[in-house]
């Protein structure tokens, strides 16, 4: 029985050309994490990290992507383009898989605020 | 072309100790891990240990046969790995090979891991 | 640690016989961190096949990999001379990685 709970970053903005922190957590489970998949609305593959073997980034996202703080992610020189959904995927022995959303709006205004309270989606 | 081409093998007394080096070309070091195998004399492949690469911050990891005695290090600058081995035994008799560790996902989303270029090799002699 | 069991010990064939090559996982592994090495007398080791099926850069095709779970084989179709060797599976995950003990492919 899945019993956890993603937490995430939900609703969040920042400013274009900024960066901004990708963060889940998983509460209320004893399962083990084995894997951490971090994509974007598009379906692609931003960054796993595996609990084994690290972090792999991908190779189109080498240069603006670094992993941490923990199981986030940091996507940094932001573009209008970077708008739209990222998704944690927490794959956990003997639960299964757990999903989280997120939601990431671009802003050109330099008075962008970038939100870090973490709720329940 | 990419290469790999150890140093600093050599005759040392049990007790002891040595530094080995891998020096790396033609590809770009940082991005890799890099793993430390040994052979004894007649024997098969172990795994020493290695090193992650600059987004796993460098992390080591090691056999339990070397823990707490191999200490493995890198600098990416010089494109080089380090072995230092310290309190030698006469087991740690072997060839000692670096190899390039090649760890990503692929499309299909799967985990990939494997030694996909290797040194040739420098000997390490413990005996009194 | 996974013990990686490699059987035959020693496989004594003729060039042009078909050489299948064992390695039993003590529990199951992923196929995708499952790789196979050749090694020569004297030389350094060589990447065969990674995610047990998949053929390294310049490896001639009858060289091939399978199995999935505990059970793994490498085949080679019809044996060339130069394949002659000792080879060594080897998985990474879990940790840590370990290689199996190897079969020596000799000449009959």
């Known amino acids: 029985m899945m019993t956890g709970t993603i937490e995430t970053t939900g609703n969040i903005s920042a400013k274009k050309g900024g960066s901004v922190i990708l963060q889940c957590h998983l509460s209320s489970t004893m399962a083990q994490v084995t894997q951490v998949n971090w994509e974007q609305h598009d379906h692609s593959l931003l960054a796993i990290r595996n609990a084994e073997l690290g972090w792999h980034i991908y190779p189109a996202f080498k240069d603006r992507v670094a992993p941490g703080p923990g199981l986030g992610l940091t996507l940094q020189s932001l573009t209008m383009n970077d708008t739209g959904e990222y998704f944690c995927t927490y794959h956990t022995y003997p639960d299964g898989t757990y999903r989280g959303r997120i939601f990431l709006e671009v802003l050109e205004s330099s008075v962008a605020e970038h939100s870090a309270r973490f709720q329940i989606p | 072309e990419v290469q790999l081409v150890e140093s600093g093998g050599g005759l040392v007394q049990p007790g002891g100790s040595l530094r080995l080096s891998c020096a790396a070309s033609?590809?770009?070091?940082?991005?890799?891990?890099m793993d430390w195998v040994r052979q004894a004399p007649g024997k098969g492949l172990e795994w020493v240990g290695r090193?992650?690469?600059?987004?796993?911050?460098?992390?080591?990891e090691y056999a339990a046969s070397v823990k707490g005695r191999f200490t493995i290090s890198r600098d990416d600058s010089k494109n080089s790995l380090y072995l230092q081995m310290n309190s030698l035994k006469t087991e740690d008799t072997a060839v000692y090979y670096c190899a390039r560790g090649q760890y990503y996902y692929g499309s299909d989303r799967r985990g990939y891991y494997y030694m996909d270029v290797w040194g040739q090799g420098t000997t390490v002699t413990v005996s009194s | 640690e996974i013990v990686l069991t490699q059987s035959p010990g020693t496989l004594s064939l003729s060039p042009g016989e078909r050489a299948t090559l064992s390695c039993r996982a003590s529990?199951?592994?992923?196929?995708?961190?499952l790789a196979w090495y050749q090694q020569k007398p004297g030389q350094a080791p060589r990447l065969l096949i990674y995610?047990?099926?998949s053929r390294a850069t310049g490896i001639p095709d009858r060289f091939s990999g399978s199995g999935s779970g505990t059970d793994f084989t490498l085949t080679i179709s019809r044996l060339e001379p130069e394949d002659f060797a000792v080879y060594y599976c080897q998985q990474a995950v879990p940790s840590p990685l370990t290689f199996g003990g190897g079969t020596k492919v000799e000449i009959k």
């Open positions: 090193t992650r690469n600059k987004v796993n911050s460098y992390y080591t």
């Open positions: 033609g590809f770009t070091f940082t991005d890799y891990y």
């Open positions: 529990q199951s592994v992923s196929s995708s961190y």
């Open positions: 995610g047990a099926s």
